[in-house]
């Protein structure tokens, strides 16, 4: 017989399966051009020696044999006596150490009988229904296929699971969707219906991440307030990276998660935009207000759980920056501009109450005036810091206000509403004798010391209702008692107390009278 | 709902032909391979064969060879098995079953009895 | 072709937990699907692929698998739990599907 042809005469060699475990198995015979077949086969146990033999029956019942030696893969022609129209049934005998081992057979029309491709195109990924789909296009003249797709995670070995019959020009396969861990895919694929048809090779990996994206685990931390009113935010740890199964390790597109970073500025509500989003790794320069930060974490399946902190205000005051003048037609107020065309935010509320309830007034975009200096004026119409308390007020700015990272914090200081001068005229004025020639003046303290930096000073003042001399002695915000001294027995005084602002006089409490009583020796 | 709805219970004589059918509803009949399972009184389950139904391709277990076929007609949706050369060994609850991604039966028709007695 | 070996019977107490093992060559490439089948109904799916339930399946029934074996384990069994048990797998070598010989399970 010629070595390209089957062979129909009896192999040389006895006809006795052994029924030995190992031998040869998997026999895989297809089509592989117009006119030529391949058939391969694989062989369990040790090779040396092992001389392989392809048999093939025909339909009339005829048989024939192609002598393989030791290779497990043999080609030939339509030409070779072998009917590839049609159907036909094919096994390997292998001869090893004296006995014969036999693969199960095939059955199969071996003209038809095409080898399969494994998706190769883009394969689309989506979820439905808490499972994975997979969607690609079928290769070009392989409608109808079986299709099996394998699948791992990190820690566990591969397995097998099935798509389905596929029948179509797009081919689609259900899998299963890990929650919290990233998976690869291979997708394989063989003719659908023919026995002994040999599976294609294995896709190339499709990494998929988990339903759930991790968790970010990142800590911020926040500078000191700037000279140009900009702390920066800063990242102390990294987000934890996703394990990867090992055909996704490198370059792996489908499980990448990504971190934004979302600002929610809670100070100065009646700004135009509260809340913005970035990227991580882009990490702002933030004003001194109070903000909500959050980190989402997302994958290609949407957005996972975030983490969220709260950066409180920077409480840092000013004491002098800010200038209040109160006129009879209203307030103003007069700080240093910063730039040309600011746009600035005034806020307020009261001091010792909930931040919920601060009060804000934008301003159009200003440039300085002559003097270097920014203003907000209101009228008392407005009742805007009209009651007579503490505020704290604090003023932003921004040259783009609709970006919620351009803004700074200008200042921050506190300012007694109303009319401030007379709410702040401390009460409760006594004299008390100290010495023969000195008494001791106390008070209750001014509501403006409730306002930190507003009470510039107290100022006792004391007539002495013979002479009308009258002398004044500045005493320290933080004091409430004062000694006057040189005063002469038998005379009558009158004390009076008032507390001063920077930009303000207070009202003189009601005139208190009193008088050093003469001593009288024995 | 997802559903496989079987025929009425059969008594055969020995060397007779049953055919069991198996209606689907409630899915893509052509998308999911349909298998029958029997089971013989007091005894395990048996995997018999499986169909594909987009198109009509068969496997069957090497036991049933040459005596089990089984068709689809895509138009009712429905899947049928016949068993020829019957004996009183192949009396038993036949079972068509639905296969997921896991080659396991999610969906089971609810059995048709088949009694093979002379 | 593969085969699937279960033991034929296991006891367990009621509330008590309760494993029952499913052995062949062919767990070590495909996931095992587990079935109840409770006397003149037909099979129940109970657990398939890694461990999955399908709805209406109580949480008390889980699944694992490791190398050439495929486990059930009923965490708390219940006297409703009381049944025959079967595996299943695809056969490693060919296209066909196989089950193991089931398992009765009492509840004492």
């Known amino acids: 017989c010629r070595t390209s042809e089957c062979c129909f005469q009896d192999p040389p060699y006895p006809d006795a399966d052994s029924g030995s475990a190992s031998g040869p198995r998997d026999l895989r015979c297809y089509r592989i051009s117009s006119d030529r077949y391949e058939c391969s086969w694989q062989y369990e146990g040790p090779t040396a020696g092992v001389s392989h033999f392809l048999r093939c029956c025909l339909s009339s019942g005829r048989c024939c044999y192609f002598a393989a030696g030791s290779a497990t893969r043999l080609q030939f022609s339509d030409q070779a006596g072998v009917s590839v129209l049609y159907t036909v049934t094919l096994w390997v005998e292998s001869w090893a150490r004296n006995q014969t081992e036999k693969s199960p057979e095939v059955t199969l029309q071996l003209y038809n009988s095409v080898k399969y491709e494994p998706p190769l195109g883009d394969i689309k990924v989506s979820k439905l229904a808490g499972q994975l789909r997979m969607e690609w296009e079928t290769p070009d003249n392989q409608v109808g296929a079986e299709v099996q797709f394998r699948h791992r995670t990190p820690s566990s070995p591969w397995k097998l699971g099935d798509c389905g019959p596929q029948d179509d020009d797009t081919e689609s396969c259900l899998c299963p969707l890990e929650m919290n861990v990233a998976q690869e895919f291979q997708l394989r694929r063989r003719q659908l219906g023919s026995q002994g048809s040999s599976w294609s090779k294995w896709s190339s990996p499709v990494c998929v991440p988990p339903e759930n994206p991790p968790q970010p685990q990142v800590r911020f931390s926040v500078e000191q307030l700037g000279q140009d009113g900009r702390r920066r935010l800063t990242l102390k740890e990294q987000p934890t990276q996703l394990e990867l199964p090992e055909g996704c390790q490198g370059l792996a597109p489908g499980t990448e998660v990504t971190y934004r970073l979302q600002l929610h500025m809670l100070s100065c509500p009646c700004k135009a935009k509260a809340t913005r989003t970035l990227h991580l790794g882009k990490m702002p320069y933030l004003s001194g207000a109070a903000y909500n930060v959050a980190v989402i974490s997302s994958n290609q399946f949407g957005p996972g759980l975030n983490q969220t902190w709260h950066i409180p205000a920077d409480t840092h005051t000013e004491p002098v920056a800010l200038n209040i003048s109160v006129g009879t037609n209203g307030t103003t107020m007069y700080w240093p501009a910063r730039a040309q065309s600011m746009t600035y935010c005034i806020e307020w509320q009261p001091v010792g109450q909930d931040g919920g309830l601060a009060t804000c007034s934008l301003t159009a975009p200003q440039d300085p005036d002559p003097a270097g200096m920014a203003t907000y004026s209101w009228s008392r119409e407005s009742g805007a810091m009209g009651q007579e308390k503490c505020y704290y007020i604090t003023i932003f700015a921004s040259a783009h206000p609709e970006k919620l990272t351009l803004w700074s914090t200008v200042l921050s200081t506190y300012h007694f509403g109303g009319n401030a001068s007379a709410a702040g005229t401390p009460h409760h004025v006594s004299v008390k004798n100290h010495s023969l020639d000195s008494v001791s003046v106390d008070w209750a303290p001014s509501l403006l010391s409730t306002c930190p930096g507003v009470l510039k000073e107290y100022v006792v003042r004391c007539r002495d209702e013979d002479s009308k001399q009258v002398s004044e002695h500045p005493v320290q915000p933080t004091e409430t008692q004062v000694t006057l001294s040189g005063l002469r027995a038998g005379v009558a005084y009158t004390v009076q107390v008032r507390a001063d602002t920077a930009w303000l006089r207070g009202v003189w409490s009601q005139p208190q009278r009193f008088s050093i009583e003469v001593q009288v020796s024995d | 709902q997802v559903q496989l709805v079987q025929s009425g219970a059969e008594v055969k004589k020995p060397g007779a032909s049953v055919r069991v059918s198996c209606k689907a509803s409630?899915?893509?009949?052509?998308?999911?391979?349909i298998h029958w399972v029997r089971q013989a009184p007091g005894q395990g389950l048996e995997w018999m064969g499986i169909?594909?139904?987009?198109?009509?391709?068969?496997s069957y277990a090497q036991k049933f060879q040459g005596r089990v076929t089984m068709t689809r007609d895509t138009s009712t949706t429905t899947v049928y098995m016949e068993l020829s050369s019957l004996r009183s060994e192949d009396t038993a609850v036949y079972y068509c079953?639905?296969?997921?991604?896991?080659?396991?039966?999610?969906?089971w028709g609810q059995g048709t009895m088949v009694t093979v007695s002379s | 072709s593969s085969e699937l070996t279960q033991d034929p019977a296991v006891s367990v107490a009621l509330g008590q937990t309760v494993r029952i093992t499913c052995q062949g060559d062919?767990?070590?490439?495909?996931?095992a699907g587990w079935y109840q089948q409770k006397p003149g109904q037909a099979p129940v799916l109970v657990i398939y692929g890694k461990n999955n339930r399908p709805s209406g399946i109580p949480d008390r029934f889980s699944g694992s698998s490791s190398e050439d074996t495929a486990s059930l384990t009923i965490t708390g069994a219940q006297a409703e739990d009381e049944a025959d048990y079967y595996c299943n797998s695809r056969d490693s070598s060919d296209n066909h599907l196989v089950f193991g010989g089931g398992t009765k399970l009492t509840v004492l």
């Open positions: 169909i594909n139904p987009s198109g009509g391709s068969t």
């Open positions: 079953a639905k296969s997921n991604w896991a080659y396991a039966f999610d969906i």
């Open positions: 062919s767990l070590s490439s495909y996931y």
């Open positions: 409630g899915y893509t009949f052509t998308s999911y391979y």
